[in-house]
C-alpha cells in the first residue's frame, strides 16, 4: 500500500467512489457475478476480488471509475499482505492456543452462524 | 455438521475443552506452529486448521482430548461449507455491488487495519 494513503482512508474513499459510479457499473444487465450467500465476508475475499476483476473487464474505463478499480486493487494487495502474515511467524504451542481461543471466541460472538 | 449439535454450541463446548486440556497440549516445548500476527481471524482459517493438525499429530490421544480434536474438525467442516458458499450463486451486478459495499463497510468499521 503506498504510504500516501493509509488503508483505512483508502477503504472510505472506495466506498464513496462505489456510490458515485453505481449507475455506470450496473449498466451491464446480462452480467452475472458470484455473490456469497452468507455475511462472513473475510472468508470470501478471493471470490469478491474475482468478481471485481470480472466487473472491471466489462466496464468502460476512464476518469474516477479507473480510480475506483485502482483502489480496489490496492485493497486486494493489503488483504494479500494480511494473508501472508497468517503463516509467517512460527510460535510456541502456548501462543497458538491463545490465538485459537481468541479465534473460537470471535466465532462464538461475532460470526453469523447458520444453524 | 451433525444435527445433534448446532455449530454455535459446538464452538462453546470446544472453548471449554481447550481450557481443560491446555496443560496436556503445551507439553511439547519444541513444537512451533504458525500464529497470525494480526487479528483478522477469518483470513487465516487455513493456517489455523493446519496448526491444529500439527498439534493433533503431536498430542497423545484418548478421552476428552479426542473430543476436542473431533469438535475442531467439525468446525473446520462448517467453515469449509461456508467457503463453498462464497462462489455458488451467480447474481446480477446490482447484488454484487451491494455485497461489495457491505464488505468494504465491514472492513471500514470492524477490521483491524494497521497503518
Amino acid at each position: 500500500i503506498p504510504t500516501e494513503i493509509p488503508t483505512s482512508a483508502l477503504v472510505k474513499e472506495t466506498l464513496a467512489l462505489l456510490s458515485t459510479h453505481r449507475t455506470l457499473l450496473i449498466a451491464n444487465e446480462t452480467l452475472r457475478i458470484p455473490v456469497p450467500v452468507h455475511k462472513n465476508h473475510q472468508l470470501c475475499t478471493e471470490e469478491i476480488f474475482q468478481g471485481i476483476g470480472t466487473l472491471e473487464s466489462q466496464t468502460v474505463q476512464g476518469g474516477t471509475v479507473e480510480r475506483l478499480f485502482k483502489n480496489l486493487s490496492l485493497i486486494k494487495k493489503y488483504i494479500d499482505g494480511q494473508k501472508k502474515k497468517c503463516g509467517e511467524e512460527r510460535r510456541r504451542v502456548n501462543q497458538f492456543l491463545a490465538y485459537l481461543q481468541e479465534f473460537l471466541g470471535v466465532m462464538n460472538t461475532e460470526w453469523i452462524i447458520e444453524s | 455438521i451433525p444435527t445433534e449439535i448446532p455449530t454455535s454450541a459446538l464452538v462453546k463446548e470446544t472453548l471449554a475443552l481447550l481450557s481443560t486440556h491446555r496443560t496436556l497440549l503445551i507439553a511439547n516445548e519444541t513444537l512451533r506452529i504458525p500464529v497470525p500476527v494480526h487479528k483478522n481471524h477469518q483470513l487465516c482459517t487455513e493456517e489455523i486448521f493446519q496448526g491444529i493438525g500439527t498439534l493433533e499429530s503431536q498430542t497423545v490421544q484418548g478421552g476428552t482430548v479426542e473430543r476436542l480434536f473431533k469438535n475442531l474438525s467439525l468446525i473446520k467442516k462448517y467453515i469449509d461449507g461456508q467457503k463453498k458458499k462464497c462462489g455458488e450463486e451467480r447474481r446480477r451486478v446490482n447484488q454484487f455491488l451491494a455485497y461489495l459495499q457491505e464488505f468494504l463497510g465491514v472492513m471500514n468499521t470492524e477490521w483491524i487495519i494497521e497503518s
Epitope: 510456541r92 501462543q95 481461543q101 481468541e102 471466541g105 | 500476527v37 483491524i112
Partner: antibody, heavy 119, light 107 residues
C-alpha cells in the same frame, strides 16, 4: 496518535494494594494486547504479564501470580494492573506497553507510574 | 524461564564510536528478540524487533543481528542522544524476560 497514559504516582503501606491504570487512545483498544512491566529503582525491567482486551484472557509471570491482577474496561479503553500484599521490594515504576501483534514486540509504552511502598 | 545475559553491563565510548552490545539466551528463542533503549527518568523505547528489524523512525545507525541464542545490537556511529541504557527482551516464550541492561556512558 497512539498513546498510553498512566495514572499518577502512589504511596502505599506494606500489606496494602495498588491499582494502576493505563488509558489507551488513537487505536482500537481490543486489537492489541497490553503488557505490564516494572522497574525497581536502579534496576532492570521485569515482565508482569499481559491481557488481551478482546477476551480478557490474561497471562502472568509466575512470580506475580496470585498477587497481580490484570483487568480492562473496554468502555473507557483502560487497562488496570492491581498488585496486592505490597512489600517494600514492590517499590518500582510500573509501565504498560502495547503489543504490536499477537505476542509481538512492545511498540508503544506508557509514561510509567511510580509506586512507593513504605511504612 | 529463559535467562537473557547481556554484556557488557556498562561501557564508555565517545561520539562517533562503533558500539556493540551482545545478548545471549539460555535456550533457542528463534528471532523473537527486541532491543529497547531507556534514558534516565524516561519510559523505555523499542528500537529493533525480530532481532534485526528496525522500527519506523529509529535512526539507521542502529542495527541488530543474530538468531537462536546469540544476538547483537550495533550502533555504527554513536551520537550524543544515544547515551542511555539498552535492554534485550525475548518474547518467544512466557514469561517474557529482559537482559540486565547495558549502560552506555560518555568517555
Amino acid at each position: 496518535q497512539v498513546q498510553l497514559v498512566q495514572s499518577g504516582a502512589e504511596v502505599k503501606k506494606p500489606g496494602a494494594s495498588v491499582k494502576v491504570s493505563c488509558k489507551a487512545s488513537g487505536y482500537t483498544f481490543t486489537n492489541h494486547h497490553i503488557n505490564w512491566v516494572r522497574q525497581a529503582p536502579g534496576q532492570g525491567l521485569e515482565w508482569i504479564g499481559y491481557i488481551n482486551p478482546y477476551n480478557d484472557y490474561s497471562r502472568y509471570n509466575q512470580k506475580f501470580k496470585g498477587r497481580a491482577t490484570l483487568t480492562v474496561d473496554k468502555s473507557t479503553s483502560t487497562a488496570y494492573m492491581e498488585l496486592s500484599s505490597l512489600r517494600s521490594e514492590d517499590t518500582a515504576v510500573y509501565y504498560c506497553a502495547r503489543d504490536y501483534g499477537n505476542f509481538w514486540y512492545f511498540d508503544v509504552w506508557g509514561q510509567g507510574t511510580l509506586v512507593t511502598v513504605s511504612s | 524461564d529463559i535467562q537473557m545475559t547481556q554484556s557488557p553491563s556498562s561501557l564508555s565510548a565517545s561520539v562517533g564510536d562503533r558500539v556493540t552490545i551482545t545478548c545471549k539466551a539460555s535456550q533457542d528463542i528463534n528471532s523473537y528478540l527486541s532491543w529497547i533503549q531507556q534514558k534516565p527518568g524516561k519510559a523505555p523505547k523499542t528500537l529493533i524487533h525480530r532481532a534485526d528489524r528496525l522500527i519506523d523512525g529509529v535512526p539507521s545507525r542502529f542495527s541488530g543481528s543474530g538468531s537462536g541464542q546469540d544476538f547483537t545490537l550495533t550502533i555504527s556511529s554513536l551520537q550524543p542522544e544515544d547515551f542511555a541504557t539498552y535492554y534485550c527482551l525475548q518474547y518467544d516464550d512466557f514469561p517474557y524476560t529482559f537482559g540486565q541492561g547495558t549502560k552506555v556512558e560518555i568517555k
